[in-house]
Interface confidence: medium
């Protein structure tokens, strides 16, 4: 009378039907601790970035500043939700904050992902225009076009993340003691087509939120590096150290972005490919188990950006020092104006004021005046 069992599919795929899966064992306090660290560093760092950008006078701001500010806003709005995710993970996936915050905080993760990567792409393109085509595209980089580009990227990010807002919900799926915050496809798909929806949304988010922007960034940096290398060949030997610094900063930007987001997108893509390629069970289980850590690494990016985009600039550090100085009520008017002037726009790339080589709004007009010698991250 014994019944032999047919092994069925696990959720989301109908290939490795013989695989045996168990509840994912959380890493105790490790992931929540990282989330809280990212929250603390992210709020502080991105707060400082915003403060540094917005304390400068409007005339002193450059086209890149709007992307810098947007990036900081995106990261800031996301990192403030991390205490919720830290709590959720620490409670072994029990969501106590209700459906609204489940939807909102999940939505902000993806808005941040898209907005951040679009801002980084915008910055890369801005730098490309500044270095590779400064004369021909000077007008493209006016504050107005920067504002339009930012508005477009925010609208795009908000729209691309909308499926998460719609489909996220809370429920006690087969578990009366815990409430999960999860993607519920039942309103748009039958059980048999849920996997298609998951793959569709996964592929599109990886393509639009990583592959395309990263390709654009690499292309921009390729031409930037080519242009800089060409100019440095005409420079004296003492320019070598500064050339290496600038190129290394560019490499750090691209590599950090890739290191933070590549594991997340790669593991996600490999998992989805599993339904076609039939991975061995052990590999499939490995992908399932490392995915939370890949997600964690991608979240870390939200607190690294301020360091990478701002802290490389000595003038940004001066602005921070100036703020700390003011915070301790030791701020003399002279020291404030001196450091304040220097850090008016940390992304400007100029230590000198608008001079003979400047166009409207202080834009540099002559290609041979590209400021290789400036120890700044965002070069105008």
């Amino acid at each position: 009378m014994e019944e032999g069992g047919d092994f069925d599919n696990y959720y989301g795929a109908d290939n490795q039907s013989e695989c045996e899966y168990t509840d994912w064992k959380s890493s105790g306090a490790l992931i929540p601790a990282i989330y809280m660290l990212v929250f603390l560093l992210g709020t502080t760092g991105n707060g400082l970035v915003l403060w540094t950008v917005f304390r400068s006078s409007r005339e002193k701001r450059r086209s890149a500043d709007i992307f810098i500010a947007s990036l900081a806003v995106a990261d800031l709005t996301f990192v403030v939700t991390l205490p919720l995710w830290a709590t959720y993970t620490y409670r072994d996936y029990d969501w106590p904050f209700g459906t609204f915050f489940c939807k909102l905080s999940s939505y902000l993760i993806f808005v941040n992902m898209y907005a951040s990567v679009f801002c980084l792409t915008g910055l890369s393109f801005d730098r490309y225009l500044a270095i590779v085509r400064p004369v021909a595209n000077a007008r493209l980089r006016l504050r107005v076009s920067g504002a339009v580009a930012t508005a477009v990227l925010w609208v795009l990010a908000a729209l691309l993340a909308m499926p998460v807002m719609v489909l996220r919900t809370t429920g006690d799926l087969e578990n009366t003691t815990k409430v999960q915050c999860y993607m519920d496809y039942s309103m748009v798909a039958t059980v048999s087509s849920e996997w298609a929806w998951e793959v569709g949304l996964g592929v599109s988010s990886t393509t639009v939120g990583f592959v395309v922007p990263f390709t654009i960034m690499l292309t921009c940096y390729f031409f930037i590096a080519q242009t800089i290398a060409g100019h440095f060949r005409k420079e004296r030997i003492e320019g070598l150290r500064k050339r290496r610094r600038l190129l290394s900063i560019i490499v750090v930007l691209v590599v950090t972005f890739a290191l933070c987001w590549m594991p997340y997108h790669l593991v996600k893509t490999l998992y989805m490919l599993g339904s076609l390629l039939h991975w061995p069970c052990d590999f499939d289980l490995f992908l399932m188990n490392i995915f939370p850590y890949c997600t964690c690494i991608s979240y870390v990016n939200s607190c690294l950006n301020p360091f990478l985009y701002a802290f490389f600039d000595p003038r940004f550090r001066q602005a921070c020092t100036s703020m700390l100085c003011c915070g301790q009520s030791r701020c003399a008017g002279t020291s404030h104006s001196s450091s304040g002037e220097k850090s008016a726009s940390y992304s400007s790339g100029h230590s000198q004021g608008p001079g003979p080589n400047m166009g409207k709004g202080g834009e540099q007009m002559h290609e041979k005046s590209i400021p290789y010698s400036q120890e700044t991250l965002v070069v105008d």
Epitope: D6, D8, Y11, T22, D92, S186, E198, L287
Partner: antibody
Framework: EVQLVESGGGLVQPGGSLRLSCVAS????????MSWVRQAPGKGLEWVAN????????YYVDSVKGRFTISRGDAKNSLYLQMKSLRAEDTAVYFC??????????????????????WGQGTTVTVSS | DIQMTQSPSSLSASVGDRVTITCRAS??????LGWYQQRPGKAPKRLIY???SLQTGVPSRFSGSGSGTEFTLTISGLQPEDFATYYC?????????FGQGTKVEIR
């Protein structure tokens, strides 16, 4: 071959106790939730209890709460049902079954129930004076 | 507890007939429902999970549909081995509850 074999059934007086066992073979026992389901003579199926892989979660039907205890011995690939204060209405064939869950890749902590995919042949418990 | 009401409680049909069994939940259970077949003296066998997903190895003549409170199991082209008792099981909340069963007999 995937198999579940129940034992421990028999005749017991009302108020008495009995311990049912279920030995699993052909699959990794400690990877699965397990359930007990019973069927009174000539009646339908009634879910009794289930237990998580590590024993940290256990659920019971109201009629057996406080009287029955589900447990597992992973070293022996065994599932148990300790039955106390037995009543005439507990007379039934008791099946042990393997619960099948799916797990969300994206949303950790979320699991989807796929039903009981492997059943034992059943063991008969008769409560009578 | 969620009550599951199956109808009809029994039916007579001939080989080749199309048979439909309905299961109604006392409250919404999304698609958290499975269908089981039990032949006399045997253990139950899972046919359908998640309301409409066919268990591996189960013939395609069996199909499930429905969501919320109303669910159906359809056997299109009844075969001699299909004469058995069919149960629905809700697993939306604990305790899990079965329908009272539908006995499919030979006419």
């Amino acid at each position: 071959e995937v198999q579940l074999v129940e034992s421990g059934g028999g005749l017991v007086q009302p108020g008495g106790s009995l311990r049912l066992s279920c030995v699993a073979s052909g699959f990794t026992f400690n990877n699965y939730w397990m359930s007990w389901v019973r069927q009174a003579p000539g009646k339908g199926l009634e879910w009794v209890a289930n237990i998580k892989q590590d024993g940290s979660e256990r659920y019971y039907v109201d009629s057996v709460k406080g009287r029955f205890t589900i447990s597992r011995g992973d070293a022996k690939n065994s599932l148990y049902l300790q039955m106390k204060s037995l009543r005439a209405e507990d007379t039934a064939v008791y099946f042990c079954a393997r619960d099948r869950f799916g797990y969300s890749f994206y949303d950790k902590g979320v699991r989807y129930y796929y039903g009981m995919d492997v059943w034992g042949q059943g063991t008969t418990v008769t409560v009578s004076s | 507890d969620i009550q599951m009401t199956q109808s009809p409680s029994s039916l007579s049909a001939s080989v080749g007939d199309r048979v439909t069994i309905t299961c109604r939940a006392s409250q919404g259970i999304r698609n958290d429902l499975g269908w089981y077949q039990q032949r006399p003296g045997k253990a139950p066998k899972r046919l359908i999970y998640a309301a409409s997903s066919l268990q591996t190895g189960v013939p395609s003549r069996f199909s499930g549909s429905g969501s919320g409170t109303e669910f159906t199991l359809t056997i299109s082209g009844l075969q001699p081995e299909d004469f058995a008792t069919y149960y629905c099981l809700q697993h939306n909340s604990y305790p899990r509850t079965f329908g009272q069963g539908t006995k499919v007999e030979i006419r």
